[in-house]
Interface confidence: low
């Protein structure tokens, strides 16, 4: 899919909500200039498109929510890439501009007569995109036109700054919270010396910055910090892995504030370099419990501890999604491409030149096979409902006693909608309260996951703890079968009694050599020996000095036995 022709999913309505989903993977390095996106995605793409379409159906059939108003949508593909998402956002804006000029009677034909042509309805708000870096670029554009944006997975801390991103809101917490959760895990297992890796781009950079700041305050040292793009080549990942091995065996823990595909790149490099089992990866929610990150590289991922936004599966979505079939699902323009990709087959009637598969798709194929719901499904749905409730509250205040869109809501004023959205609170799809603080952020609740070998060649994620508004709970026995199995990630071992730490020049504070105090010295503090004053001697535990008792010789005491140097 290149920049020439972009596919769009439409659903008609009185009010149109825009959405940006990563229907395809981001362009590879060699295709970036032509904005040619990668393969179709199921969880992050097709499932989210279907969630939007079906959630709007549910909202439209709910008589208590926006009665007499139909919500429609326009879904575009962001390809998890800023340039593509911006191009698509400009399309949203263009529709809005033409529509508002039309409202004001500014659209006229070349001959001067007024136009009877009705362009598309304006987009009142945008759901998404998923990536923080992409969301920032999109927000920079949308806020110029007062179009509110509600994100379902863009968690960068930068987006909390309302002076810069006024029209941005999210149903997920800021990354400052998961950085704190990661530091709390590091502290729990007494890992004082860790390597750090992050994905280049806003999500990774700001998240890692927070992790490093918090680590420093807790006395945790970073052996070295590295950054890499998710779409970097094999050589780049191999080079990074070789650098990480240079800190072994001391820095065995690698804190990775990374997108899922960066983690996958690391796992693949571990496979190539034979480094499975050498590191313990501590991953942010970009990894969470995604199988597309670990598939084929499970041995390398074993032991990984990850942060996952708390979001249970949405049963009603599966009930809808698993029944979908390519011969009947025509409203999702990417569905046939996805079906062929998912089952590696060619659909009958699909142009041969567009398909790279020889085998024809069997009619018995079903999405139930190996189905995994998108881990952020609940957030996607909550973001859509937030927009609906915001519009509902706005309608209630602007059109009291009126069912439907009154004149006061035509056209919809983005400033008023933003105001209404910020005040919105409702029970989310998983039964939790959805509300926004003054920065448009939602509260932080995370699950701690552990990727384990459950049996021979069977691997899975298991929930081993939670982090809820500052409180970490971990089932240590589930993570480590024995206390002795807890991985050590320290630069230097504690010094023995009577020794002090000598920090090597240019080293971090966690790396030292242990040096014994001299015979007449005691340990003043962990870095200093002090000589006892004349007439005193170090105590047995070397923590202070005792006066040497003065012994006076009396007549009748045995004579002291002196030895000459010559005496052998």
């Amino acid at each position: 899919q290149s920049s020439e022709r972009r596919v769009v999913a439409h659903m008609p309505g009185d009010i149109i909500i825009g959405a940006l989903f990563s229907v395809h993977h981001q362009p590879t390095v060699d295709k970036v200039h032509e904005r040619k996106c990668g393969a179709v995605r199921e969880q992050y793409g097709i499932q989210r498109v279907e969630a939007m379409l079906h959630t709007l159906e549910r909202i439209n059939s709910d008589p208590t929510l926006l009665p007499n108003i139909t919500l429609g949508c326009e879904i575009r593909d962001s390809c998890w890439h800023s340039a593509v998402a911006l191009e698509q956002s400009i399309e949203f804006i263009r529709d809005s501009l033409i529509s508002s000029e039309e409202e004001e009677g500014l659209v006229r034909c070349v001959d001067g007569s007024s136009s009877s042509f009705r362009s598309k309805k304006p987009i009142v708000g945008v759901i998404g995109p998923g990536s923080s870096s992409v969301a920032i670029q999109v927000q920079n554009l949308l806020q110029l036109f007062n179009i509110p944006q509600i994100a379902y997975s863009a968690t960068s801390m930068d987006l909390s700054d309302k002076t810069l991103f006024k029209y941005f809101m999210r149903v997920v917490p800021s990354d400052a919270q998961q950085a704190r959760a990661m530091v709390d895990i590091v502290k729990r297992y007494n890992w004082t010396y860790v390597s750090a890796v992050h994905t280049e781009g806003n999500y990774g950079e700001s998240g890692m910055e927070a992790f490093k700041d918090m680590s420093a305050k807790e006395g945790i040292c970073i052996a070295h910090s590295y950054k890499i793009y998710s779409n970097a080549g094999e050589q780049s990942f191999d080079k990074l892995l070789k650098k990480l091995t240079s800190h072994l065996p001391k820095a065995r823990v690698v804190a990775c504030f990374c997108e899922g595909m960066t983690v996958r790149g690391l796992l693949m490099a571990m496979r190539r370099l034979g480094l499975a089992g050498e590191f313990l990866l501590l991953g942010s929610d970009g990894w969470a419990d995604r199988y597309d990150v670990t598939d084929g590289y499970q041995r390398e991922a074993v032991g990984g501890i990850t942060i996952k936004l708390q979001s249970p599966d949405v049963k009603w979505f599966d009930d809808y999604y698993l029944k979908l079939r390519p011969e009947t699902n025509h409203r999702n323009p990417w569905f046939q491409e996805f079906w062929q990709h998912r089952f590696q087959c060619r659909l009958e009637g699909f142009p041969q030149e567009n398909s790279k598969y020889n085998k024809t798709c069997d009619s018995s194929l079903t999405l139930k096979t190996h189905h995994v719901q998108d881990s952020k499904m609940g957030f996607v749905i909550n973001a859509i409902y937030s927009m609906a409730y915001g519009l509902h509250n706005m309608q209630m205040s602007l059109c009291p006693g009126y069912a439907g869109l009154c004149d006061a809501m035509k056209p919809i004023d983005g400033r008023k909608l933003l105001e209404s959205l910020m005040k919105t609170n409702f029970t989310g799809v998983s039964g939790d309260m959805i509300l926004f603080d003054e920065n448009g952020d939602s509260p932080g609740r995370y699950e701690i996951m552990n990727f384990k070998e459950m049996g021979k060649d069977y691997f899975d994620y298991i929930n081993v703890g939670s982090w809820d508004n500052g409180e970490l709970k971990m089932d240590d026995d589930e993570v480590w079968s024995k206390k002795s199995n807890i991985i050590r990630s320290v630069c230097s071992e504690p010094c023995e009694k009577g020794q002090i730490k000598v920090i090597r020049k240019g080293e971090v504070s966690c790396c030292w050599t242990c040096t014994p105090c001299k015979e007449n010295e005691y340990v003043f503090d962990e870095y200093t020996c002090k000589a006892c004053q004349l007439g005193s001697w170090p105590t047995d535990d070397l923590t202070g000095c005792d006066l040497i008792p003065v012994q006076y010789l009396r007549w009748g005491d045995p004579e002291p036995d002196y030895k000459d140097d010559d005496d052998k």
Partner: antibody, heavy 120, light 109 residues
């Protein structure tokens, strides 16, 4: 049942070229495996030559094999090893083996081997 | 390239006895070591991978240990069927290359 089978061995003159083929049956070759080549001179020990990753076709060679030996994935079920500028020292039984890594997990499945004799 | 030195070249032991084979890598290879058993006219058979993991179907009499540069294969309760040549295979991550040890012939009396 999973099996590997080498073919293409035989007598070749010094300086000649030979291509060995490893045929995979009973396994999903397109998955995450490495197909590797190991040789064993008569009465001698094992010597690693190269590996190719089934996923992306990435190749890995012993330093002595670079330039003279080339491993390729020619179809969804076959891998080849092309050997050029052969000398008597290349006389050996050539094994094809499958592993989950270039070497980190060892090679769990081996073919019976094919004998290559370099002689004038 | 990595060099694997295997000792001894040959060892003899009685049925029911124990044999220890050592393998030394010229550079640290972490846990990237495998052990194989080879009988005349047959391809090698994987016994141990990643230094200490027993391949499925291999009796627990075979035990691998070590990491870094020093590795050991211990065969206890020797059986006649254990008579074979044993090879270690080291994998050096930095150069993505493998090397086999010279082999140890185990003779069971």
């Amino acid at each position: 049942q999973q099996q590997l089978e080498e073919s293409g061995g035989g007598l070749v003159k010094p300086g000649g070229t030979l291509t060995l083929t490893c045929k995979v049956s009973g396994i999903d070759f397109s998955s995450y495996y490495y197909m590797c080549w190991v040789r064993q001179a008569p009465g001698k020990g094992l010597e690693w030559i190269a590996c190719i990753y089934a996923g992306d076709g990435g190749t890995y060679y012993a330093s002595w094999a670079k330039g003279r030996f080339t491993s390729s994935k020619t179809s969804s079920t076959t891998v080849t090893l092309q050997m050029t500028s052969l000398t008597a020292a290349d006389t050996a039984t050539y094994f094809c083996a499958r592993g989950s890594g270039v070497g980190s997990y060892g090679y769990s499945l081996w073919g019976p081997g094919t004998l290559v004799t370099v002689s004038s | 390239d990595i060099v694997m030195t295997q000792t001894p070249a040959s060892v003899e032991a009685a049925v029911g006895g124990t044999v220890t084979i050592k393998c030394q890598a010229s550079e640290s290879i972490y846990s990237n070591l495998a052990w194989y058993q080879q009988k005349p006219g047959q391809p090698p058979k994987l016994l141990i991978y990643r230094a200490s993991n027993l391949e499925s179907g291999v009796p627990s009499r075979f035990k691998g240990s070590g990491s870094g540069t020093e590795f050991t294969l211990t065969i206890s309760d020797l059986e006649c069927a254990d008579a074979a040549t044993y090879y270690c295979q080291g994998y050096y991550a930095s150069t993505t290359t493998n090397a086999f040890g010279g082999g140890t012939e185990v003779v069971v009396k």
